[in-house]
């Protein structure tokens, strides 16, 4: 009779975390009589996964009834797989012996790899705002994935970025891995509505990448432009001067009118007009009673935006 | 010697569409000599999947070298699985015969089920806008999933909806399935920023449901409220009357001022103020030269919003 063979038909099995893994094993003969055991790993440090003869293995179920006399199928199913279960599993036939059973023959082994999904990527931006034409850094982090192979891309709106650096840790074998990437983004005036997107592709995601986003609105400060103009006279002896504060972000803005250097009125912008690009406009107007002035008046519109140093624009009002 | 057994250790195997399926099969003896074949299904209509002896099976690879003299492992791998591959696969041993080989023994069969992901859900809303307190319908559709079991929920913002009806087609067995659901949503004035979400859970999604969204902003019309008020006089002989047009959506709005029923000025709203709830406000003002009027004046602010019938509010200006 042909000598018993231990057949482990699958060289490798890949299972998603949380699922069950079935490891196939069949004997080609009932003899020599003796139990089978499953181990993870080989050599002295191998870990017992299942012993047909004795012990309690709550996560392991046998596919066939191993107590049946003519059973040759010793496949097992391991429930609730985690990345820590990855490794090579050996189905080992023992022959009966005294005082101990003797290892007789091992299967070729089945490598179990565990597919664990990356956590949702978390994107974080700079601690302080920067103005257009400056460069800011965004980081993207995700953890707990396996296998190690992962692809990370950065986008600003729909456009792929190239200035970034990515690390996957640890460098060696591990039950699961983490990724950390830093992208450098040059701000433009139109970036209030812009987003940076960190996109990760992994075998567990079946072609649907995970995305983490951050709004550049949290990272940008667009300083206002000021324009002071005189409006057509609505009534005699009255001049209507407006200060158009344009294209600023974020909202926080305080405006002070000065007449010949003296504070005339201070206002905090409230009902702002939002532009399509997400910046804001605001207009303030000053009615000047020309009867009260003999000489020309210098009107100054002074704006303090988002806690920054004030900017101003002046207008010389001719008293005719 | 014990008679040859055909061992198919796995009763069932579940594979994601696009992956490969490994079907395990082992013989317990080299005799009787003869080839093996794999079939899908049993009986007269069974479909040949692999023939060790002859034929071309581009999607099938053998796990072991079947030409090796003492090979007892006849496991196969089928690549690029689609829902159409679902079924029960039998590993069948033939013994050599003349003129034809004779079927000798079949394995117990392995049922292959294919997990196919639902397509991204597409949510569509009503063709015409409706006003608050009215009910509108949204539909959600997804296709191509397997197995048939699927769970669909509707949410308005974070709150689960109960008024919906869902169908999964076809009712009988199929390689893949489609889902169609219709939800009825009662609009409220604050719904410009609201979303309806169609959420689908399926075994292939590993606990991350697919979501389709629609914005109620596409389905709602919030008519404006009008308020006409007189502002403090900036100059003698001038009355400043404002028309505050509040909480309307969408943007499209035309305003006409009438003095004693005669058109004074028509404006199209452009620079609007956006409220937190997504509705818009706009203010128009009219400077009335009281010198030109002997008697009281009735000023009317008439607004046409989003192509609907005009609404108006009047104000009696007393000429003192």
């Amino acid at each position: 009779e042909d000598e018993l063979q231990v057949i482990q038909p699958e060289k490798s099995v890949s299972v998603a975390a949380g699922e069950s893994a079935t490891l196939c094993c069949a004997m080609t003969s009932l003899i020599p009589v003796g139990p089978i055991m499953w181990f993870r790993g080989a050599g002295a440090g191998r870990e017992l996964i299942y012993n047909q003869k004795e012990g309690h293995f709550p996560r392991v179920t046998t596919v066939s009834e191993l107590t049946k006399r003519n059973n040759l199928d010793f496949s097992i199913s391991i429930s609730n797989i985690t990345p820590a279960d990855a490794g090579t599993y050996y189905c080992v036939k023992f022959r009966k012996g005294s005082p101990d059973d003797v290892e007789f023959k091992s299967g070729a082994g089945t490598e179990l790899s565990v597919r664990a999904k990356p956590s949702a990527p978390v994107v974080s931006g700079p601690a302080v705002r920067a103005t257009p034409e400056h460069t800011v850094s965004f980081t993207c982090e995700s953890h707990g994935f396996s296998p190690r192979d992962i692809t990370l891309k950065w986008f600003k709106n729909g456009n792929e970025l190239s200035d970034f650096q990515t690390n996957v840790d640890p460098a060696g074998d591990s039950v699961s891995y983490s990724i950390h990437s830093t992208a450098r983004v040059v701000l433009t005036r139109g970036d209030v509505h812009s987003q940076v997107i960190c996109e990760m592709a992994h075998i567990t995601l079946q072609g649907d990448p995970l995305r983490g986003t951050a709004n550049l609105s949290e990272a940008i400060r667009v300083p206002p432009t000021l324009e002071v103009t005189q409006q057509p006279m609505r009534a005699e002896n009255q001049a209507n001067v407006t200060c158009q504060v344009s294209n600023f972000y974020p909202r926080g803005l305080q405006l002070t009118w000065l007449e010949n250097g003296n504070v005339s009125r201070t206002e905090t912008a409230s009902t702002l007009i939002e532009n399509k690009d997400g910046t804001y406009n605001w207009m303030s107007w000053l009615l000047v009673n020309t009867c009260a002035h003999r000489d020309d008046v210098v009107l100054t519109c002074q704006v303090e935006h988002d806690g920054q140093q004030a900017v101003s624009k002046s207008y010389a009002l001719e008293i005719s | 010697e014990d008679e040859l057994q055909v061992i198919q250790p796995e009763k069932s195997v579940s594979v994601a569409a696009g992956e490969s399926a490994t079907l395990c099969c082992a013989m317990t003896s080299l005799i009787p000599v003869g080839p093996i074949m794999w079939f899908r299904g049993a009986g007269a209509g069974r479909e040949l999947i692999y023939n060790q002896k002859e034929g071309h099976f581009p999607r099938v690879t053998t796990v072991s070298e079947l030409t090796k003299r003492n090979n007892l492992d006849f496991s196969i791998s089928i690549s690029n699985i689609t829902p159409a591959d679902a079924g029960t696969y039998y590993c069948v041993k033939f013994r050599k015969g003349s003129p034809d080989d004779v079927e000798f023994k079949s394995g117990a069969g392995t049922e292959l089920s294919v997990r196919a992901k639902p397509s991204a859900p597409v949510v569509s809303g009503p063709a015409v806008r409706a006003t608050p307190e009215h009910t509108v319908s949204f539909t959600c559709e997804s296709h191509g999933f397997s197995p048939r079991d699927i769970t669909l929920k509707w949410f308005k913002n974070g709150n689960e909806l109960s008024d919906f009806q869902t169908n999964v087609d076809p009712a009988g067995d199929s390689v893949s399935y489609s889902i169609h659901s219709t939800a009825r949503v009662v609009l409220t004035r604050g719904d410009v920023h609201s979303q309806v979400i169609c959420e689908m859970a399926h075994i292939t999604l590993q606990g991350d449901p697919l979501r389709g969204t629609a914005n109620l902003s596409e389905a709602i019309r919030v008519p404006p409220t009008l308020e006409v008020t007189q502002q403090p006089m900036r100059a003698e002989n001038q009355a400043n009357v404002t028309c505050q047009v509040s909480n309307f959506y969408p943007r499209g709005l035309q305003l006409t001022w009438l003095e004693n029923g005669n058109v004074s000025r028509t404006e199209t709203a452009s620079t609007l103020i956006e409220n937190k709830d997504g509705t818009y406000n706009w203010m128009s003002w009219l400077l009335v030269n009281t010198c030109a009027h002997r008697d009281d004046v009735v000023l009317t602010c008439q607004v046409e919003h989003d192509g609907q019938q005009a609404v108006s509010k009047s104000y009696a200006l007393e000429i003192s």
């Epitope: 009779e1 009932l30 020599p32 009589v33 107590t67 022959r95 009966k96 005294s98 003797v102 | -």
Partner: antibody, heavy 120, light 107 residues
């Protein structure tokens, strides 16, 4: 067919030795261990020991240690049990039995038994 | 050594009766218990192995149950050929031990 054929009855004097044979046929002899079980007249079953030709392993009951030897001859598919220094309480029917459990011990095939009488 | 205690030591029953024999191990033996039938002048015959598995060729009126320390052999409907002595045997470890036997007699 699958069977175990034992040697004939023996009458022995106290202090003598007896060697009982058990010939296997119809199956692969080296594949299965053989146990020896005895039964004194009107008594229950008593396990004596075990031998596995595959590795030459043996295991004997403590009370018989030093008096019993079990051997096999794979060329003739025969198992032997020799019991020395016989006493009157060794009078019994001696059975050989094939042991078939993979993780456990049970006996699915028995010889017909050999009566050994120890009498002065 | 693992002691096996069988009860009752004898039972009188009639054809068609349901007969139950119990066996207790002095320590846990998982499911590694066998049941044998022996008739006078004959070798024992294996009925049940691994506590509940019916040996090939044995009628289905015989069944076994139990695990750990307590086991039962049941004959669902006693037939004339079933009058015999029944032994349990632990197969968990050396030395292999048998119960004292239960004699099933005609009432």
């Amino acid at each position: 067919q699958v069977q175990l054929v034992q040697s004939g009855a023996e009458v022995k004097k106290p202090g003598a030795s007896v060697k009982v044979s058990c010939k296997a046929s119809g199956y692969t002899f080296t594949g299965y261990p053989i146990s020896w079980v005895r039964q004194a007249p009107g008594q229950g079953l008593e396990w004596m020991g075990w031998i596995y030709a595959y590795g030459g392993n043996t295991n004997y009951a403590q009370k018989l240690q030093g008096r019993v030897t079990m051997t096999t001859d794979t060329s003739t598919s025969t198992a032997y049990m020799e019991l020395r220094s016989l006493r009157s309480d060794d009078t019994a029917v001696y059975y050989c039995a094939r042991e078939a459990g993979s993780s456990w011990y049970d006996f699915d095939l028995w010889g017909r038994g050999t009566l050994v009488t120890v009498s002065s | 050594d693992i002691q096996m205690t069988q009860s009752p030591s004898s039972v009188s029953a009639s054809v068609g009766d349901r007969v139950t024999i119990t066996c207790r191990a002095s320590q846990g033996i998982s499911s590694w218990l066998a049941w044998y039938q022996q008739k006078p002048g004959k070798a024992p015959k294996l009925l049940i192995y691994a506590a509940s598995n019916l040996q090939s060729g044995v009628p289905s009126r015989f069944s076994g149950s139990g695990s750990g320390t307590d086991f039962t052999l049941t004959i669902s409907s006693l037939q004339p050929e079933d009058f015999a002595t029944y032994y349990c045997q632990q197969g968990a470890s050396f030395p292999i031990t048998f119960g004292g036997g239960t004699k099933v007699e005609i009432k």
